[in-house]
Interface confidence: medium
């Protein structure tokens, strides 16, 4: 019997969804040469959840309307989970003077407008890094800017108007660094069609080694959205990302670097990235810095993370201590480091997925170990997981909603630590909540920096 139109539409949506998840989220359907094995429905569901989580949609695991709308939105062709070319965590340019060449020009715009848009797009990144870009007209450039349609020699065919607008390759020789723009789009200097400057800023981010961001305000967010180019600025996330690869501009710094200067400890708006006890001390992490607070003493000292642990990154996002083992776990993105007796253990970082998180979890917001239960609580967005440190596995029945089980806390938190045998201290922005886990309620509301006598 022929399919009725709604079944047919549903089938098309599923096929479209599969294709999208294959391209951008590494779904391995394996319906082609390697094997005729069918993927499990769970794998598809998990990939939908991963996509929804990354793009800030409601995580349902279903191809619902908002998910399909997002899948149809014009976007960059680089995957959100990495298959493309060694981004993220891959190569960077090992020099500060980088050349680019415009291989050919789109007929949609004047040549001078193309030159200007591309030059301004490079300038966006040189403003916040030590990188200097210069255009060459002949010879081999580090970054080649190409307008092409359909299949164009790099295994990543463009798809006509809409859909994929452009893609770029991470730093490297040959095709490395090159940025390709789909000639089937209508490229413009304004809000009509597809704005070349905005798209180029994004693609050059890839050319410099950045992956996609899940922050909708970031220029490195995967989907295209026009913003006023006269007031356009990189988000803090974009700046943090690029400066983690290249550092900040050494001279003529034109844009403030959120990680550059030591944050003011008594700023009433101060928030922390992660907090944990280490023996009788409390470590407060923020950007490249940490403050050390020795219990019951008013004095605190600020240090660079790299001065204590040179092999660790800045921007630690979560931390917890198992005091009985003299172990501290530090988390950033999908990796974690183990510190034993204040020394980093070899063979780290490792993947957070070794704890048993599903694939869509890409970073941990906060973590805390409770020695009374020998359990670690991991907070991710508005949910939390509970991990049995003895059995080295996640407890069943998780994740659960933070707001449901921690009265008055949430929906999301920045940091948490355990102290005095009965309290969790939760940090949310510039606020801190002392939470009695036996009474299961907040017992005090404080400023985040209350530990410093501010």
């Amino acid at each position: 019997l022929p399919l009725n139109s709604s079944t047919s539409l549903e089938k098309n949506n599923v096929l479209f969804g599969e294709r999208y998840l294959e391209k951008f989220y590494g779904l391995e359907i394996n319906k082609l040469p390697v094997t005729k094995m069918k993927y499990s429905g769970n794998l598809m569901k998990e990939k939908i959840q991963e996509m929804q989580h990354f793009l800030g949609l409601k995580v349902t695991g279903q191809l619902d309307t908002s998910t399909l709308e997002m899948m149809h939105a014009p976007r960059c062709g680089v995957p959100d989970v990495h298959h493309f070319r060694e981004m993220p965590g891959g190569p960077v340019w090992r020099k500060h003077y980088i050349t680019y060449r415009i291989n050919n020009y789109t007929p949609d715009m004047n040549r001078e407008d193309v030159d200007y848009a591309i030059r301004k797009a490079f300038q966006v990144w040189s403003n916040v890094t030590p990188l200097k870009f210069s255009k060459i007209n002949t010879g081999m450039a580090d970054i080649l800017v190409v307008f092409a349609r359909g299949a164009h020699g790099d295994f990543h065919a463009f798809d006509g108007k809409g859909g994929i607008l452009a893609h770029a390759f991470g730093p490297g020789s040959g095709i490395g660094g090159d940025a390709h723009f789909d000639e089937d789009e209508f490229w413009t200097t304004h809000s009509g069609g597809t704005n070349l400057f905005l798209t180029a800023v994004h693609e050059i981010g890839h050319s410099l080694g950045l992956g996609h961001s899940s922050d909708p305000k970031a220029v490195m967010f995967p989907t295209y959205k026009y913003v006023d180019i006269n007031t356009f600025r990189l988000s803090a996330d974009d700046i943090r990302g690029i400066q983690s690869l290249y550092g900040d501009p050494k001279e003529n710094q034109r844009l403030p670097n959120p990680d550059n200067s030591e944050p003011a400890l008594c700023d009433p708006n101060l928030s922390f990235d992660a907090v944990t006890t280490v023996g009788n001390k409390i470590f407060f992490f923020k950007d490249r810095f940490f403050w050390l607070k020795v219990s019951e003493r008013p004095k605190t000292s600020v240090n660079l993370i790299s001065s204590l642990w040179p092999t660790l990154p800045s921007g630690i996002e979560a931390a917890y201590e198992i005091e009985a083992r003299n172990q501290v776990f530090l988390f950033k993105d999908d990796k974690y480091w183990l510190i034993s007796n204040l020394r980093p253990e070899p063979n780290y970082p490792k993947s957070i997925h070794s704890f048993g998180f599903p694939n869509f979890v890409k970073k941990i917001d906060a973590a805390v170990f409770n020695p009374r239960f020998y359990r670690t609580y991991f907070f991710v967005d508005n949910q939390y997981w509970r991990y049995d440190e003895r059995r080295q596995m996640m407890d069943p029945g998780y994740p659960k909603l933070i707001t449901k089980n921690f009265q008055g806390i949430g929906p999301k938190i920045d940091a948490v630590f355990y102290s005095k045998n009965k309290y969790y201290y939760f940090f949310q922005g510039s606020n801190q909540f002392e939470y009695d886990f036996l009474l299961q309620r907040i017992t005090k509301t404080l400023k985040s920096n209350s530990w410093f006598g501010c």
């Epitope: 391995e28 394996n30 094997t35 005729k36 298959h83 493309f84």
Partner: antibody
């Protein structure tokens, strides 16, 4: 620079076993589908086996099904082919190959090879 | 399985000549999922063409591919000394993938 270095080939008697290894470098191994392709002396190319990027799915040519096992260790950037119950007709140069993520207008294909190793010779003879 | 045949088996030509190599599939190859590889004596194969007509990175423009369905062609417009080698077609639209037996281009 992408490099694929096969090892483990050699002379083996019919019915014997060999384990081939392929050390990969110069790219993010864990994100690529990988294949073994073989070439009998003076003959053409034959796809032998493939494995998905995570190792979660595998496939085999009918001629080796049940005798060969493909596997990978992404933490070591290494691809393996365990060959049991070897036959004279398995004599060939075995190439370790990388399969790029190729998208065209009709979707996703992991179906062609962009890099080949130098090959390792397996000779099955009594 | 999709069977691939190539003709001629051997093509004897001189440098500067135009070479036309043919590849035929036993059934239609979906989405022009056909690749061509070159194998020089004593070396591993290398990818020349994919998607029937797209040149792989670094491949000179004297190599061009065409065709769809069951009939595909590789043309080398002007043979250079390094082009004398064996050429294999491969389909990847059906499972399992299959290679043709090859065409050897040798010097006349």
């Amino acid at each position: 620079e992408v490099q694929l270095l096969e090892s483990g080939g050699g002379l083996v008697q019919p019915g014997g076993s060999l384990r081939l290894s392929c050390a990969a470098s110069g790219f993010t191994f864990s994100t690529y589908q990988m294949w073994w392709v073989r070439q009998a002396p003076g003959k053409g190319l034959e796809w032998v086996s493939g494995i998905s990027s995570s190792g979660g799915a595998t496939g085999y040519a009918d001629s080796v099904k049940g005798r060969f096992t493909i596997s990978r260790d992404n933490s070591k950037n290494t691809l393996y082919l365990q060959m049991n119950s070897l036959r004279a007709e398995d004599t060939a140069v075995y190439y370790c190959t990388r399969v790029p993520h190729y998208y065209d207008s009709s979707g996703y294909y992991g179906g062609l090879v962009d890099y080949w190793g130098q090959g390792t010779l397996v000779t099955v003879s009594s | 399985d999709i069977q691939m045949t190539q003709s001629p088996g051997i093509l004897s030509l001189s440098p500067g000549d135009r070479a036309t190599l043919s590849c035929r599939a036993s059934q239609s190859v979906t989405s022009s999922s056909l690749a061509w590889y070159q194998q020089r004596p004593g070396q591993s194969p290398r990818l020349l063409i994919y998607g029937a007509s797209s040149r792989a990175t670094g491949i000179p423009d004297r190599f061009s591919g065409s065709g769809s369905g069951t009939d595909f062609t590789l043309i080398i417009s002007r043979l250079e000394p390094e082009d004398f080698a064996s050429y294999y077609c491969q389909q990847y639209g059906g499972s399992p993938i299959t290679f043709g037996p090859g065409t050897k281009v040798d010097i006349k």
